[in-house]
């Protein structure tokens, strides 16, 4: 949101670290300070881990392991508060990128699995395409166990996976995780890449 020309962004990385960044055109050459507390009755602490942009403070990283409570914060120019707010941190969740992604092939289907995150109300999304496809196809499940059927064993497919917070649970302000690395598969075997120009299918041998 904008306040006194200050744009604020909050990201709660995997329920571990909160990043609050600001973009204040009015204070572009100023080292604004960030003060915070997790309890409305406590005194504010000052940030000890600032993010810098062009030599000036532009954000703060806070350790906030598995917290679903309110972050109170004040961005100040000297002693003057430029923006003061409180936010429920969990509504700005960005899950971590999927880890230990595995592919299990069975004929024209593949099951993509990865390590489930320790908290719930997430969607695990697999996107895939072959060079024949004009856009990515997508399938998602509540756990990291996604089976995609109807694939052509002769085609090369690119896959990547990400995690999203359910909007009906966490609201509209979460962020999807970064995508996992793209992996390419053909005939149940991993490939370095899928050729941009589709290779013609091998001729079927007559019996």
């Amino acid at each position: 949101g904008a306040a006194e020309g200050v744009q604020i962004q909050i990201i709660y990385f995997n329920l571990e670290t909160v990043q609050v960044t600001w973009n204040a055109s009015k204070y572009s050459r100023t080292n604004l300070t960030f003060h915070y507390r997790f309890n409305g009755d406590e005194a504010y602490d000052q940030c000890t881990n600032y993010l810098l942009q062009e030599g000036h403070t532009s954000g703060c990283l806070l350790d906030a392991e598995q917290r679903d409570d309110i972050l109170y914060f004040s961005i100040r120019n000297g002693t003057h508060p430029v923006f003061t707010a409180s936010r429920w941190m969990v509504y700005y969740l960005k899950p971590s990128s999927p880890k230990h992604v595995r592919f299990s092939w069975h004929q024209d289907a593949v099951t993509v699995t990865c390590s489930d995150l320790s908290y719930g109300d997430l969607l695990y999304e697999v996107q895939y395409r072959s060079p024949f496809d004009t856009e990515w196809q997508s399938k998602q499940e509540n756990t990291c166990n996604v089976t995609i059927e109807g694939l052509d064993a002769e085609k090369c497919y690119s896959f990547w996976v990400r995690v999203k917070a359910m909007e009906d649970v966490y609201g509209p302000d979460t962020y999807p995780s970064d995508w996992s690395e793209v992996t390419c598969w053909q005939r149940g075997e991993i490939r370095d890449a899928c050729a941009e120009t589709p290779t013609p299918p091998k001729p079927k041998l007559s019996k």
């Epitope: 949101g1 604020i8 707010a85 969990v90 649970v169 609201g171």
Partner: antibody
Framework: EVQLLESGGGLVQPGGSLRLSCAAS????????MHWVRQAPGKGLKWVSS????????YYADSVKGRFTISRDNPKNTLYLQMNSLRAEDTAVYYC???????????WGQGTLVTVSS | DIQMTQSPSSLSASVGDRVTITCRAS??????LAWFQQKPGKAPKSLIY???SLQSGVPSKFSGSGSGTDFTLTISSLQPEDFATYYC?????????FGQGTKVEIK
């Protein structure tokens, strides 16, 4: 469909206690912060208390701090407000409210009336 | 605490009228402002959040605007079901606080 159903209101003498309940359904209760808001007869709305999804974070208006306790039982999808040392000025309809992040106080229960009088 | 001041406190209008209610915050609240409608004997209903976003299922005759300290709620064409009390609320900074309400009555 989100539903919030308050109960436990009634007539109580000054200094007495009351426990309000709010049965929630239609959403993932354990992940949602929840609130109590009250409205004295013929008056406006006043925030009373909030609790985080896990129940670890609790917040109170100065007027009720030390007398009221907010809590939740996530397996039972129920929110509570324990009200002690009640005063005449606590007389109000008490609403249970769901937090929606930037969507604010997005769903409200129908309310339960608490009357503190001798 | 942040004070929220609504004006007017009451107004009389006719069906079909365009109605505007204003809300002023005692300090900058960005766009973390909500509007609620309350009918007699009923619970408040959320109409608008983050100053201008319509809650799901709310008709487009309701609109909100503003940022910082000054906000407005507009009902483009008042209908019989819109006669009610309207409250603004800031939720930028705890504790959340409400305006005193604006009662919209039939002229």
């Amino acid at each position: 469909e989100v539903q919030l159903l308050e109960s436990g209101g009634g007539l109580v003498q000054p200094g007495g206690s009351l426990r309000l309940s709010c049965a929630a359904s239609g959403f993932t209760f354990r992940s949602s912060a929840m609130h109590w808001v009250r409205q004295a007869p013929g008056k406006g709305l006043k925030w009373v208390s909030s609790v985080s999804g896990s129940g670890a974070g609790t917040y109170y208006a100065d007027s009720v701090k030390g007398r009221f306790t907010i809590s939740r039982d996530n397996p039972k999808n129920t929110l509570y407000l324990q009200m002690n040392s009640l005063r005449a000025e606590d007389t109000a309809v008490y609403y249970c409210v769901k937090e929606g992040g930037s969507r604010g106080f997005d769903y409200w229960g129908q309310g339960t009336l608490v009357t503190v009088s001798s | 605490d942040i004070q929220m001041t609504q004006s007017p406190s009451s107004l009389s209008a006719s069906v079909g009228d365009r109605v505007t209610i204003t809300c002023r915050a005692s300090q900058d609240i960005s766009n973390y402002l909500a509007w609620f409608q309350q009918k007699p004997g009923k619970a408040p209903k959320s109409l608008i959040y983050t100053a201008s976003s319509l809650q799901s299922g709310v008709p487009s005759k309701f609109s909100g605007s503003g940022s910082g300290t000054d906000f407005t709620l507009t009902i483009s064409s008042l209908q019989p079901e819109d006669f009610a009390t309207y409250y603004c609320q800031q939720y930028n900074l705890y504790p959340p606080t409400f305006g005193q309400g604006t009662k919209v009555e039939i002229k």
